[in-house]
Structure formats: C-alpha cells, structure tokens
Amino acid sequence: VLEVYYTSLRCRCVQESSVFIPRRFIDRIQILPRGNGCPRKEIIVWKKNKSIVCVDPQAEWIQRMMEVLRKRSSSTLPVPVFKRKIP
C-alpha cells in the first residue's frame, strides 16, 4: 500500500536511509509531502518484520518503486493505491 498523507505534524524522520529494501520485505509505504511543519518530503516504510524506516526520497530505488506503484494504481481501478488524508 502506498499512501500520501497531508498532516500538520512536524518532521517524523530522525534519520533517513538509502539502503535498498526488496519489495517482498515491504508492507506499506507512506509519503509525507514537504510543508505543514516539515521542510522536507518524508518517506516512511513499514517492513514485514515489524520494523520501520525512513527512506531518503532521493534514493533511486524508492523513486523507481513509487513510479511502478503509481502506474499500477492508475491502471487497477476502482481501488486506489494513493490515499490522501487532508485534516
């Protein structure tokens, strides 16, 4: 599941990693766009082993993965991959 959240919270990520995470290990991805208290875009990945990590949005592998998920979400209706939550 890929999610985009708009919140008024400050930055969530303490440290970001560029280390590749194979898709089979990923349970969920959340994208927090910059603004609303945090000056940078944040990407949070929940792994299937019950750990959680912030991924550097500039990491090539996460950009490629998000592009694949975007394409998949636009072609598999009616269930959207993006969930926009606007408080």
Epitope: R12, C13, V14, Q15, W46, N49, S51, I52, C54
Partner: antibody
Framework: QVTLKESGPGILQPSQTLSLTCTFS??????????VGWIRQPSGKGLEWLAN???????YYNPSLINRLTISKNTSNNQAFLKITNVDAPDTATYYC??????????????WGQGIMVTVSS | DIQMTQSPSSLSASLGDRITMTCQAS??????LIWFQQKPGKSPWPVIY???NLASGVPSRFSGSRSGSHYSLTISSLESEDMADYHC?????????FGSGTKLEIK
Amino acid sequence: QVTLKESGPGILQPSQTLSLTCTFSGFSLSTYGMGVGWIRQPSGKGLEWLANIWWDDDKYYNPSLINRLTISKNTSNNQAFLKITNVDAPDTATYYCARSELVMPYVPFDFWGQGIMVTVSS
Amino acid sequence: DIQMTQSPSSLSASLGDRITMTCQASQDIGIELIWFQQKPGKSPWPVIYYTANLASGVPSRFSGSRSGSHYSLTISSLESEDMADYHCLQYKQYPFTFGSGTKLEIK
C-alpha cells in the same frame, strides 16, 4: 489516555504454567502498527524482553525461552496474554506488559503497565 | 543475539553533578537505542529514543549520544528526582535486548 494492567497468579509452584493477562485501554490491537510486549524483571535485577504480539497476529519471542512461551491476544476484549510453561524459581520476577506503536518516530514500549509480582516457590 | 553491556552498574553522585552512563552494543544497532528511567517501585519510562532524542516531557538536562558502538546517557546537572535505575534497550532487531541497568544514587 493509554493504560495497561497486568493480572495473574501471585504465586505458583515449580513445573506449573504461568498465565498472565494484560488488559489495556486507549488503543486497539486491531489498529495497524499496534503491538503489545511482555518484559520481566527479577527483583533488583535488569529487564528481560520476553515476547511481542502485533495487530496482524505476528509474534516474536525471546529465543532463550521460545519453547516455554506463548503470546496471544483477544482484540475485541482489549487483552493480550502470556503463558510460560514449566516455571521454576528463576522465573520469579515482576512481569510487565507494554505497548508498542509502529509509527515514526518509533518508540517501542512507550507505555507500561504497573507490573505484577510473580513468585515461583514450592 | 545482540548483547548490550551497560556500565557502571551503580553510580553515586551529588546534586548538580554531571553524570554519564554507557551501553556498548556487540553488533551494529545504528541509532535504534532507547534509555528508560525506572524510579523505585515504578515502571520504566522512556527518556531518550533513537539514541539522542528527548522523549516528551523529559527535562533538557538529559541527553543521549553515540560514539561508534558506545551509547551514552548524560545528565548535565543532577537533581534529586533523577534518582532511579536506567536501562538501555536496542531495538534494531529481534530479540530486543536490554542492558543490565545502572542504579543512580544521590550522595
């Protein structure tokens, strides 16, 4: 607010099975990212992590005790359970349950119960 | 399993002193380390998470740092309410492991 409370027998005999219940409020184990863990502390000593159970029924155990531990939950009753088989004197300790929420920033065991003192004695 | 070696086991200091306690990890745990404070007869409570971040409501005299595999908790000016046991916890990987604890006493 988040609260947790442990319950179970205060005393039991060697070779018996210890059954502990954690009753909690302020969160639900049906919510994505929620978990409950069990930790114990012998009197005057350090903490020892025992087990975790997560919203999706994923379970993790301390390998040194894995053959004796069973963690489970009743989501609708807001309860988590821990069973320890074949107890002996070294299992005498205060047992705590604690919440973990898999969010960023991740702070496992951010809320704890008051603890329950368990004595194993013949 | 990752071993967490905590020192000293006990520490006696005067009010206003600067004190430091340490945990050493046997394997790489990144920044995934928490310090818990446990006051006498009470449950543990997080004071520092992700090695150096102050938990909500914790006074700014508490701080955490890392040097390689050594993780430190420092209290810059000791107050009487800081008398407690302190435990480190690594949560990089299962099984989660605690240090053996540091008992902080006031002289």
